[in-house]
């Protein structure tokens, strides 16, 4: 597990100092108060796929 | 192995209130949402609301703003309170745990996987 | 809300042959940035607490045996028993936890023909 102060998450996922995990960020669509939130509202969400430009 | 164990009154009045407590054993308290869902006799499930460590809700606006769910970190529990009564609100009520499952290495919830025992609660004058 | 309908609401089926259980959704549960569908399976027994069979439309809880499966996307989605046993007759349930109120389908009721 990744332990805080080391490489971050991978994008689009936050760091839960709760969980002790690296946690999606489509989580806090509904659940916008998890720890790991705040960490989500400052990058954007991992592309799925290629958008046309 | 995380274990859920609930209690609370049995048997009500209508517009008495309804009180219920969930203890969590053997697990992580914290990071994990914990849910209540009922369901009335014969028919199917209805999400109450959740709650995480820190307070912070999320709840069925069928209920009209009747529920109040509280959290206890100290002892592990969580609790359910709806006002007002009626024999509409007569079921069994169930807590549950939002499990948490990974793929590569990115953790998302995933699902209420374990489960209390279920309160029957009648409301009948 | 997200209204959640399954079908049929019984489903009489023999011993070792295919179940299957549909649940369709008002709108798409489906979250474009993960491609993640935020619905769950459950098998709830008489007496019993619903018990987490699939996660994420397709994910297999921990312990569940792999005669259950769920696919589809979006707004379509089905729950298969690939060879019924006695222990499977019981009421199956979708809900989503795309947004909140998380919603139940009204259950499908599954026996033994």
């Known amino acids: 597990e990744q332990a805080p102060g080391t490489a971050p998450c991978s994008r689009g996922s936050s760091w839960s100092a709760d969980l002790d995990k690296c946690m999606d960020c489509a989580s806090c669509r509904a659940r916008p108060h998890s720890d790991f939130c705040l960490g989500c509202a400052a990058a954007p969400p991992a592309p799925f796929r290629l958008l046309w430009p | 192995q995380v274990q859920l164990q609930q209690w609370g009154a049995g048997l009500l009045k209508p517009s008495e209130t309804l009180s219920l407590t969930c203890a969590v054993y053997?697990?992580?308290?914290?990071?994990?949402?914990w849910s209540w869902i009922r369901q009335p006799p014969g028919k199917g499930l209805e999400w109450i609301g959740e709650i995480n460590h820190r307070g912070s809700t999320n709840s069925n606006p069928s209920l009209k703003s009747r529920d109040t769910i509280s959290v206890d970190t100290s002892k592990n529990q969580f609790s359910l309170r709806l006002r007002s009564v009626t024999a509409a609100d007569t079921a069994v009520y169930y807590c549950?745990?939002?499990?948490?499952?990974?793929?590569?290495?990115?953790?998302?919830?995933?699902?209420?996987?374990?489960w209390g025992q279920g309160t029957t609660v009648t409301v009948s004058s | 809300d997200i209204v959640m309908t399954q079908s049929p609401d019984s489903l009489a089926v023999s011993l070792g042959e295919r179940a299957t259980i549909n649940c369709k959704s008002r709108?798409?549960?489906?979250?474009?940035?993960?491609?993640?569908?935020?619905l769950t399976w459950y098998q709830q027994k008489p007496g019993q607490p619903p018990k987490l069979l699939i996660y994420?439309?397709?994910t297999r809880e921990s312990g569940v045996p792999d005669r259950f499966s769920g696919s589809g996307s979006g707004t379509d989605f089905t729950l298969t028993i690939s060879s019924l046993q006695a222990e499977d007759v019981a009421v199956y349930y979708c809900?989503?936890?795309?947004?909140?109120?998380?919603?139940f389908g009204q259950g499908t009721k599954l026996e033994i023909k």
């Open positions: 053997g697990g992580s308290f914290s990071g994990y949402y």
């Open positions: 549950a745990r939002e499990g948490i499952s990974g793929s590569m290495g990115i953790y998302d919830y995933s699902g209420m996987d374990v």
């Open positions: 809900q989503q936890y795309y947004s909140t109120p998380y919603t």
């Open positions: 709108q798409s549960i489906l979250y474009s940035s993960n491609n993640k569908n935020y």
């Open positions: 994420w439309a397709s």
